[in-house]
């Protein structure tokens, strides 16, 4: 019979509001009180196995004791009522769990969406955490009919998908009830026609058609989602070139009504574009669909928009009365080629004489010409047509080039090598810039580029390497032929030399020594050599440093001590730092020449 509890706690399963006060009462049973010779004075209250201070107890009568908590802040309290029996032994009477939390807040921001082909889903903001099991019920009704409640699942308490099919063009009223052990609240009611909450499926079967007549347009066609039979649609069309990451957008006013095609204008010829489209209800009430699958299309070719860059080289070793000329040109970049270049057409006209035509697939043509003046023209051809002609005058053999550019400068900036000059007074058709890497190991093989006659500053468009010396030549080209070339050396980025100079003695005296060295080879300079430093010392003395101008190749050390071993080394410096050469030793003689001890 003692398996029966000795008493009970009231209330049995309390749920209380956080930060509120709470009182529990423990009532002892008579039989227990008799058995253990105790009364309410013997009751000890504990929470989570810790004894509660006596100040919180109230003895109500001989059988009942209460305990009061103020400002409850724990979510779960294990509360036990215990009695002190014989010899102060603690005997558990009863235990309860006090659960604390908060009543639900009024759900806010209730909104609903009808995904095409699916049932209506509503979601809301449930407010603060209650720490209690809280049930959310979505309620909906027509003026004449109540729909079944939609009970939110525990793992998704802020949304619910209704069980009934959506009916358009009839207003529905929707609200949410939130309920837990501490209370029940209702959201504001919203009243709407589900047609204004539609999220259509994206348009599908998006495809792209190009036009043979216009290289700047592509037509998109698509299949509209089925919801088109219920609502009118508007669209958002975006496009980008295949290699771009940012999208351009068709102005919304151009796509503001139901359609199944659209022609995109102002595109670049022979360029691959990527398109995507989404749609929503025409009046903007509802939701945008997801994006369609992307579709690609290539605009049609257009004739090349620019003549290729065109230049020539004359072989210096030429037979009597003839010279070998290499005509050369650059491939047009895609945005100027406007299609696949099929071939190039070159014409050569001797002064007031016959015409020679060549069709070439390469970007160079070698011809044997007499010593007369020639006019060469070059056009690039694609499927649609030919470019404008590039015209080049190859002057006669006795032509004297004049009028060079002035104040030629070259400098690195923003990881590019810039060249600038002052334009000659005469009218320049174009400029040819040639550049090559100066090297002791290999010949200077030039790359080149062409600039308009109005340009006086540009950067070299090539794969330039750091710490290489570039010889840059600028030639103005006039109507009657090329002007005088001007050249300058430059580095994209300097570095310290990879080797220092090797110093040697040219002549050694009792108190001086003439040192000499060779200029560093250009391949190891890695920049402009600005100066040298000579370091010399005796075995026991301090090192002395002497700066020497980079134009010198010898230097005289004076005030040396006779009959002394000297160690000398030399460093060369660019703008980016220096590099020491090997150390060299020499000994001054004990006596000057002709001097006797």
């Amino acid at each position: 019979e003692l398996l029966d509890p000795c008493g009970y706690i009231s209330p049995e399963s309390p749920v209380v509001q956080l930060h509120s006060n709470f009182t529990a009462v423990c009532v002892l049973k008579e039989k227990c009180m008799d058995y253990f010779h105790v009364n309410a004075n013997y009751i000890v209250w504990k929470t989570n196995h810790f004894t509660i201070p006596k100040e919180q107890y109230t003895i109500i009568n001989r059988t009942a004791s209460s305990v009061t908590f103020t400002d409850i802040s724990s979510l779960n309290i294990q509360l036990t009522c215990n009695i002190l029996t014989f010899g102060q032994l603690e005997q558990n009477v009863y235990g309860i769990t006090i659960i604390s939390g908060l009543p639900p807040e009024k759900p806010k921001n209730l909104s609903c969406i009808v995904n095409e082909g699916k049932k209506m889903r509503c979601e809301w903001n449930r407010g603060r955490e209650t720490h209690l099991e809280t049930n959310f019920t979505l309620k909906s009704e027509w003026a004449t009919h109540k729909f079944a409640d939609c009970k939110a699942k525990r793992d998704t308490p802020t949304s619910c998908t209704v069980d009934y099919s959506t009916v358009y063009f009839v207003n529905i009223e929707v609200w949410v009830e939130a309920e837990n052990a501490l209370g029940k609240v209702t959201s504001d009611h919203i009243n709407f026609d589900p047609v204004y909450k539609v999220k259509p499926n994206p348009p599908h079967n998006l495809s792209v058609i190009n036009s043979e007549e216009l290289s700047s347009i592509l037509k998109l066609t698509w299949t509209n989602p089925s919801i088109k039979s219920v609502i009118r649609l508007k669209y958002n069309i975006q496009y980008r070139t295949k290699d771009a990451s940012t999208w351009s957008q068709i102005p919304p006013e151009d796509t503001a009504s139901t359609r199944s095609s659209f022609t995109v204008q102002d595109l670049k010829p022979f360029t691959e574009y990527v398109f995507r489209i989404c749609c929503m209800k025409e009046d903007g009430k509802g939701y945008w669909s997801d994006w369609s699958e992307e579709a690609n299309g290539i605009t049609y070719e257009d004739r090349p928009s620019k003549a290729p860059s065109f230049w020539y080289k004359i072989d210096p070793s030429h037979a009597q009365g003839y010279r070998t000329v290499q005509l050369m040109w650059k491939t047009l970049p895609p945005f100027e080629a406007n299609g696949k270049i099929l071939d190039y057409e070159v014409t050569l006209t001797r002064w007031k004489s016959h015409l020679q035509n060549y069709t070439v697939n390469d970007t160079k043509l070698t011809v044997n010409l007499t010593n007369d003046r020639y006019v060469a023209t070059l056009t690039a051809r694609n499927l649609v047509g030919k470019s404008d002609a590039a015209v080049l005058t190859i002057p006669a053999c006795d032509f004297q080039a004049t009028h060079p550019v002035m104040d030629l400068k070259a400098f690195p900036k923003d990881n590019m090598l810039w060249v600038e000059w002052t334009t000659p007074r005469e009218s320049v058709k174009k400029y040819i810039l040639e550049w090559c890497v100066l090297s002791d190991k290999a010949p200077c093989i030039a790359d080149w580029q062409q600039e308009d006659g109005t340009v006086h500053r540009t950067h070299l468009r090539g794969n330039l390497a750091e710490s290489k010396c570039y010889l840059i030549t600028v030639t103005p080209v006039y109507a009657d032929g090329p002007g005088s070339p001007e050249s300058i050396k430059a580095y994209l980025k300097q570095a310290p030399p990879s080797k220092g100079p090797t110093v040697r003695t040219k002549k050694v005296g009792k108190n001086e020594a003439v040192l000499e060295w060779d200029q560093l080879p250009v391949d190891v300079q890695n920049g402009f050599i600005r100066n040298y430093t000579i370091f010399y010392r005796t075995i026991i003395g301090n090192e002395t440093a002497v700066n020497v101008d980079s134009s010198h190749t010898e230097y005289t050390l004076s005030s040396l001590t006779s009959d002394t071993l000297y160690m000398v080394r030399m460093a060369a410096y660019t703008d980016e730092g220096g590099k020491d050469g090997p150390e060299f030793t020499f000994t001054t003689p004990k006596f000057a020449q002709g001097e006797i001890e």
Epitope: E212, E213, I217
Partner: antibody, heavy 121, light 108 residues
Framework: EVQLVESGGGLVQSGGSLRLSCAAS????????MNWVRQAPGKGLEWVAY????????DYSDSVKGRFTISRDNAKNSLYLQMSSLRVEDTAVYYC??????????????WGQGTLVTVSS | DIQMTQSPSSLSASVGDRVTITCRAS??????LNWYQQKPGKAPKLLIY???SLQSGVPSRFSGSGSGTDFTLTISSLQPEDFATYYC??????????FGQGTRLEIK
């Protein structure tokens, strides 16, 4: 020379079916959208159906939706119109037309010579 | 759907006359408007596309103008072969593509 030639028209009973064909020549058929347009005797022009150049997108006028099917075979340079559940009001000359476009319009050029479909009650 | 209304429905004119046919759209269609000519027993033939562009091979006496909702087809000097039915057609908001009801041009 760009040419469109329709065939397959004729007399059919109400509720019956008919398949019209259009043979295209003189242009790259697979590059163009195609349409069927009809003209009832003594009446104006009415657009019937559209198909994109690849055949993935098709559209129909409300009056034929669910009864007519437009299709194409680019390998054969052919356009088709399968007509079923025909009604007396479907009686018309049916034209096969090529659709062209610019940035500022879409238009029909050329038109076939037409094929007459007569639906009797 | 966009409705196209042509006026007049029919008109009589003489060779050499200047003739104007108008077409009105029920909503703005930008320049997505085309004109066709149809002679009895023949298929329609494109005259003007994109409101004002003359189709290749069409005589220059035909011209088109307008934008938005109001469009005009003008024949500057009527020739005997111009007596036919003329249709306007919109391709702005499609489907459906819609035609005007036609204007019958007869010899006076």
């Amino acid at each position: 020379e760009v040419q469109l030639v329709e065939s397959g028209g004729g007399l059919v009973q109400s509720g019956g079916s008919l398949r019209l064909s259009c043979a295209a020549s003189g242009f790259t058929f697979s590059r163009y959208e195609m349409n069927w347009v009809r003209q009832a005797p003594g009446k104006g022009l009415e657009w019937v159906a559209y198909i994109s150049n690849t055949g993935t997108t098709r559209d129909y006028s409300d009056s034929v939706k669910g009864r007519f099917t437009i299709s194409r075979d680019n390998a054969k340079n052919s356009l088709y119109l399968q007509m079923s559940s025909l009604r007396v009001e479907d009686t018309a000359v049916y034209y096969c037309v090529r659709e062209k476009f610019s940035g500022t319009s879409d238009w029909f050029d050329p038109w076939g010579q037409g094929t007459l479909v007569t639906v009797s009650s | 759907d966009i409705q196209m209304t042509q006026s007049p429905s029919s008109l009589s004119a003489s060779v050499g006359d200047r003739v104007t046919i108008t077409c009105r759209a029920s909503q703005s269609i930008s320049s997505y408007l085309n004109w066709y000519q149809q002679k009895p027993g023949k298929a329609p033939k494109l005259l003007i596309y994109a409101a004002s562009s003359l189709q290749s091979g069409v005589p220059s006496r035909f011209s088109g103008s307008g934008s938005g909702t109001d469009f005009t087809l003008t024949i500057s000097s009527l020739q005997p072969e111009d007596f036919a039915t003329y249709y306007c057609q919109q391709s702005y908001s499609t489907p459906p593509i819609t035609f005007g009801q036609g204007t019958r041009l007869e010899i006076k």
